[in-house]
């Protein structure tokens, strides 16, 4: 069961896996959650009754019964991992720890104006896990305003000590705030010849890349496929690093694949969730249980529901044996990966889906698109919402997109004349406007946050957030869309769609069924030529056909320009303005969302 509260002055006895150092019990719980085996932990807080060498220790524990005996101990704080919980989990830690020096390998020292600048520097440095910053009040003159960037093998400090007038904190890479490039390509027939920091077994290069992404020291990887000539290295995933952060040598080798950590795009790509099945593949590991199951899907469900299960192998039933049920082998290992992978034995293997909640909900695959036609089908654009105003009478006002369980992203110009959020209603999971009746459930709006530089749509900053009064429970028909990664600024999106209930031509009415149109992006240079009287800034993005004919129009405002990239949908634009609708050589102009990621995160993650 899910236990979120911390147990003060309590110590769990036994079950130790490893000890790490964390600045708080809260962060110890996060570390436990992300550790492949940890189910419980005991943290020792700073206390006069405790030996200072034990302060800030976070002992990660495991137990077959999922619990351990409790002992009273002053300054000890214990708790359970969030693995047992169904809620969304994030490793993002924005806390700043005052008067704590988090020890690690100090590899960079520079002057910074503030702790925030130091944290930003850490976030944008490929090696940095955490930092310590000496404030202006630090006794040593030469160290004042010094920002020390640090890394360790585990990503957590090797020790934490009290030091007056310093502050420490973690990289915000896991908060989606890094400006580092996001290189998603996997390079076939390539070996990166740099130092290995670890090696694990993986069924394919994609799983290897995901493991690299959440390994604290891994910057890039090489995977040897099952056709690799050296048998002992087949399915081997080598996790690598280098001083420069890039591979120093690439060697052409058949049957090997290489790629990069997706650390700086992990909020818009699944990195924990290995959802595929691997046929004719057996995963070896420590056996947890053997259960009868009807199918490999059922076996995966059993593994997902068993908190200690990390991966499984299903052997289908032989003919009419055992009521058609096969054997489901639930397994685990010290690092969450199989200890060996065998092929040709007829098994079907896969991983627990328990870790999927550590990925952003927006990365979940949605129904396949309906090709052709202009009317959408239910669940095709589950992030699309219709924003209604109730004054003077109820009507569709604008589109919007779900980007979090309490947040809608839309256009600022939608709120011209809107005096209060009380008159707004957000409807999600809607296909036809006619579905909206008196008793249709909606989300009230608690707050309208308009970008403070917004004046009018044509001059940019046409972006607004709606904070909902209640949270959205994600389902197939209502779920978030990923924000683009800052590291993805150079991505060329080729599969972009605009959706909305807006007019189909300039003089028209709101449509009943949600409309969709595939529209190509237009370069800003090209767009500027079409709008000589306006300034098309880098904070805008344009889309449209040269000949016109397909475009967003009145009523689509605030809705998404959604682009699919690497199987994940990204909110690339917000419908903003244009000259007429679908006119020849007049592309639609959209708010370029990637340029506002910091603003969105600042507003939505504010304490």
């Amino acid at each position: 069961e899910c236990v979120t509260q911390l147990l003060k002055d309590t110590c769990f006895e036994g079950g130790d896996i490893t000890t790490v150092f964390t600045p708080s019990a809260k962060y110890c719980q996060v570390v436990c959650t992300y550790h492949p085996r940890c189910l419980l932990f005991t943290f020792t807080a700073e206390s006069p009754s405790e030996d200072p060498t034990r302060w800030f220790t976070c002992v990660l524990k495991d137990s077959v019964t999922e619990t351990l005996p409790r002992v009273n101990r002053t300054a000890a704080i214990s708790g359970y991992s969030f693995k047992q919980c169904s809620h969304q989990i994030s490793a993002c830690n924005k806390d700043i720890y005052v008067d704590l020096d988090m020890k690690g390998i100090n590899y960079n020292s520079s002057v910074a104006k503030s702790a925030q600048e130091c944290q930003e520097r850490c976030t944008d440095d490929v090696h940095c896990h955490f930092f310590t910053y000496a404030t202006r009040q630090f006794p040593s003159l030469e160290h004042r305003n010094i920002c020390l960037l640090k890394h360790t093998q585990t990503g957590t400090p090797t020790r934490i000590t009290k030091l007056d007038k310093v502050v420490s904190g973690f990289s915000l890479k896991s908060c989606a705030l890094s400006n580092l490039a996001c290189i998603r390509d996997i390079f076939p027939n390539t070996v990166f010849a740099d130092s290995n920091i670890d090696s694990v077994m993986a069924p394919d290069a994609f799983v290897c890349g995901r493991i690299c992404t959440h390994h604290p020291g891994c910057l890039f990887f090489t995977f040897f496929s099952q056709e690799w000539p050296k048998e002992s290295q087949r399915n081997l995933c080598l996790l690598k690093t280098s001083e420069s952060g890039l591979p120093s040598t690439r060697i052409k080798k058949s049957k090997a694949l290489s790629g990069f950590s997706l650390q700086s795009c992990r909020h818009s790509i699944p990195v924990f969730c290995h959802s595929s099945f691997y046929h004719d593949t057996d995963f070896l590991g420590e056996e947890l249980d053997i259960v009868a199951a009807k199918s490999h899907e059922a076996c995966q469900k059993l593994c997902t529901n068993a908190v200690r299960c990390q991966f499984f192998t299903y052997t289908p039933a032989q003919a009419s044996c055992n009521e058609g049920k096969g054997k489901c082998y639930l397994k685990l290992s010290s690092n969450g990966s199989p200890t060996k992978i065998l092929h040709g034995r007829g098994g079907i293997s896969g991983y627990t889906l328990r870790l999927c909640k550590m990925d952003n909900e927006c990365t979940t695959k949605i129904k396949p698109r309906i090709v052709g036609g202009t009317a959408s089908v239910r669940g095709e654009w589950p992030w699309q919402v219709t924003l209604h105003t109730t004054s003077p009478t109820q009507r569709h006002l604008c589109g919007g997109s779900i980007i979090g369980n309490q947040w809608i992203l839309t256009a600022a110009h939608c709120f011209y004349g809107v005096e209060s959020p009380k008159i707004l209603r957000v409807y999600s999971g809607i296909l036809n406007q006619s579905e909206i009746k008196e008793d249709t459930s909606f989300f009230g709006v608690q707050e309208i946050i308009i970008h403070d530089q917004y004046k009018m749509a044509e001059s940019g900053y046409d972006i607004a957030l709606l904070k909902l009064e209640t949270t959205v429970n994600y389902t197939d028909s209502q779920r978030p869309i990923c924000l683009p990664s800052k590291g993805d600024r150079n991505v060329i999106y080729t599969d972009c769609w605009v959706t909305g209930w807006g007019y189909r031509k300039l003089r028209d009415k709101i449509q009943n069924t949600l409309q969709k149109a595939k529209i190509p992006l237009v370069t800003n240079e090209e767009c500027q030529k079409r709008y000589r009287g306006h300034k098309i800034t880098h904070k805008m993005i344009c889309a449209g056909y040269r000949e016109g004919g397909k475009d967003a129009c009145k009523g689509d405002s605030g809705g998404p320009l959604s682009c699919k990239h690497n199987e994940v949908w990204h909110l690339v634009g917000i419908t903003s303005w244009g000259e007429g609708c679908a006119q020849r050589e007049r592309p639609g102009v959209y708010t370029n969302v990637v340029e506002y990621v910091d603003w969105i995160l600042e507003k939505t993650q504010a304490v």
């Epitope: 020292s109 520079s110 002057v111 310590t132 630090f138 040593s140 003159l141 310093v166």
Partner: antibody
């Protein structure tokens, strides 16, 4: 062993510039700050400024602001101090001295390694 | 800037005797103070930092004390090699400043 080796003595005319070098060895050059201190004949020590060899950031004493420039070359582990618009009162022995270890935070330190000094004579 | 004043300017002591040198700061420098020894024709040598911590290789006869504005360097039993000029220096604020020095000579 850790040492700082400075360039040789210089004789300059008033109004000219002088550039003194200080080559570090035996330690990680970019991990420590470097100070420049001068001593006029028969006088005490006078601090001129500091350079952080890692990023190249500098801080100068007000008295020398606008006349002194401290630079570094990480490839040769050398720091330079250039003093322009020389006058006779700039006649002194110029020392480079290693300062704080910047890769670790601690409260107290001193200038623990000094160069042998470079005599600069300004005379018409 | 912080003005460092050393006294006396000259101290005449016999070998084997105790020498006490003073350094006063015009405002508090906490414990951010160092002491140096300089012999004729040589570069200064760090003796004490943090007001009281001996630098590597410095004999135990050298000790430092004080904090805030008043500091003392004590040489418990003067050896012949200790006759030199001693400078204090504050590390509390820019610009760094040195005292005028105390010359310790043989009595």
């Amino acid at each position: 062993q850790v040492q700082l080796v400075q360039s040789g003595a210089e004789v300059k005319k008033p109004g000219a510039s002088v550039k003194v070098s200080c080559k570090a060895s035996g330690y990680t050059f970019t991990s420590y700050s470097m100070h420049w201190v001068r001593q006029a004949p028969g006088q005490g020590l006078e601090w001129m400024g500091i350079i952080n060899p890692s990023g190249g950031s500098t801080s100068y004493a007000q008295k020398f602001q606008g006349r002194v420039t401290m630079t570094r070359d990480t490839s040769t582990s050398t720091v330079y101090m250039e003093l322009s618009s020389l006058r006779s009162e700039d006649t002194a022995v110029y020392y480079c001295a290693r300062g704080a270890y910047l890769m670790e935070l601690y409260y107290y330190y001193g200038m623990d390694v000094w160069g042998q000094g470079t005599t600069v004579t300004v005379s018409s | 800037e912080i003005v460092m004043t050393q006294s006396p300017a000259t101290l005449s002591v016999s070998p084997g005797e105790r020498a006490t040198l003073s350094c006063r700061a015009s405002q508090s420098v906490s414990s951010n103070l160092a002491w140096y020894q300089q012999k004729p024709g040589q570069a200064p040598r760090l003796l004490i930092y943090g007001a009281s911590t001996r630098a590597t290789g410095i004999p135990a006869r050298f000790s430092g004390s004080g904090s805030g504005t008043e500091f003392t360097l004590t040489i418990s039993s003067l050896q012949s090699e200790d006759f030199a000029v001693y400078y204090c220096q504050q590390f509390n604020d820019w610009p760094l400043t040195f005292g005028g020095g105390t010359k310790v000579e043989i009595k």
